[in-house]
Amino acid sequence: SAHAHPRDSCPLGPGRCCHLETVQATLEDLGWSDWVLSPRQLQLSMCVGECPHLYRSANTHAQIKARLHGLQPDKVPAPCCVPSSYTPVVLMHRTDSGVSLQTYDDLVARGCHCA
Amino acid sequence: SAHAHPRDSCPLGPGRCCHLETVQATLEDLGWSDWVLSPRQLQLSMCVGECPHLYRSANTHAQIKARLHGLQPDKVPAPCCVPSSYTPVVLMHRTDSGVSLQTYDDLVARGCHCA
């Protein structure tokens, strides 16, 4: 069916398909060291890996995209691994009056799917 | 700033960066000919093209991903071009009792961004 459940076993082998991975990054890496005080080192969850046919399809569009990619690979790209949801984080910001807590709702991925 | 506006001019040349493109597909292409009656031919808008540094960044995560891809290209993938919104479509479905109208909210892309 067009609304088949997303496939969750990776046909390419362990760790090859779309998944969440932790990447260490410093404020300097991000170019944020001028206004973010802390933490200086961030554990950023990101979505990495391939999206083989119907693996973790985000929605109907992604399923169709996967199918058309099989038929017209030069014209239609394969789905790719992107965040499905985010975990909000709070960082300490430098302000004119001292330090404040700053919310980032869309900085750290919480889950991934193929879109 | 971490919340810089997404860049909208493509540094790779016309038509190379993430954009919406119409793809023709038949119900047979989609594997839907058993239960969708009409239309037999669909014009599906899909997101195609590359995501150079900070081009149409979906959010803070995508900006960070672009930056870290520049620093660690083997570990962090570049952002990729995916739908930012969808246009609902109505298809005619075959049912046990005849024909019904079925809405698909997430079949046709309406806009694209780099995530």
Epitope: T26, L37, S38, P39, R40, Q41, L42, Q43, T87, P88, V89, V90, L91, M92, R94, G98, V99, S100, L101, T103, V108 | -
Partner: antibody, heavy 120, light 107 residues
Framework: QVQLVQSGAEVKKPGATVKVSCKAS????????IHWVRQAPGQGLEWMGW????????VYAQKLQGRVTMTTDTSTSTAYMELRSLRSDDTAVYYC?????????????WGQGTLVTVSS | DIQMTQSPSSVSASVGDRVTITCRAS??????LAWYQQKPGKAPKLLIY???SLQSGVPSRFSGSGSGTDFTLTISSLQPEDFATYYC?????????FGGGTKVEIK
């Protein structure tokens, strides 16, 4: 693994000053801030303030402003909390806690705690 | 300051029970809530941050939910090692503030 080891218990007279230390290991000390929290006997948790080891920036709870000073020594990966003009209601277990790796305003891991008793 | 109110202040339960603790903030804090477990004579331990994200190494029987002003910590099947006091803490603005605690006791 990440560890915070605090100095031993102290008994102080009212009006005195106490300085509690918190030695960090298992991570890059100046990458994360340190929070200080206290807990009076049989009571709940009270946040005292925060310091970033990297720049020395601090935020103190309003009710302790003027009596508390938080410092760090990056050469020894140690954070310090000094509380002056001690009163009997300052009797508590004092904890240091690192910012969590995920978010600055969540606390973990924690030190084992230092009991400070203020008594004449 | 943002006040955090926990309820109940204590709960008696048996091993295997489902236990729910609630925490209410005096003003909206989005998802900026953490939950801690403290055993007698020990330091608190972070269980959940950002309302529902499980801290690494914490068993999956612990879960958190909520946003805005109302939050919940659920222990799906109470284990002997879960008898402790649980605190919520808001991380939306300074000063950081804690709830009064909920003691989970053996029935």
């Amino acid at each position: 693994q990440v560890q915070l080891v605090q100095s031993g218990a102290e008994v102080k007279k009212p009006g005195a000053t106490v300085k509690v230390s918190c030695k960090a290991s298992g991570y890059t000390f100046d990458s994360y801030g340190i929070h200080w929290v206290r807990q009076a006997p049989g009571q709940g948790l009270e946040w005292m303030g925060w310091i970033t080891a990297y720049s020395g920036d601090t935020v103190y709870a309003q009710k302790l402003q003027g009596r508390v000073t938080m410092t760090t020594d990056t050469s020894t990966s140690t954070a310090y909390m000094e509380l002056r003009s001690l009163r009997s209601d300052d009797t508590a277990v004092y904890y240091c806690a690192r910012e969590s790796g995920q978010t600055s305003s969540a606390l973990g891991p924690w030190g084992q705690g230092t009991l400070v008793t203020v008594s004449s | 300051d943002i006040q955090m109110t926990q309820s109940p202040s204590s709960v008696s339960a048996s091993v295997g029970d489902r236990v729910t603790i609630t925490c209410r903030a005096s003003q909206g804090i989005s998802r900026w809530l953490a939950w801690y477990q403290q055993k007698p004579g020990k330091a608190p331990k972070l269980l959940i941050y950002a309302a529902s994200s499980l801290q690494s190494g914490v068993p999956s029987r612990f879960s958190g939910s909520g946003s805005g002003t109302d939050f919940t910590l659920t222990i799906s099947s109470l284990q002997p090692e879960d008898f402790a006091t649980y605190y919520c803490q808001q991380g939306a603005s300074f000063p950081l503030t804690f709830g009064g605690g909920t003691k989970v006791e053996i029935k």
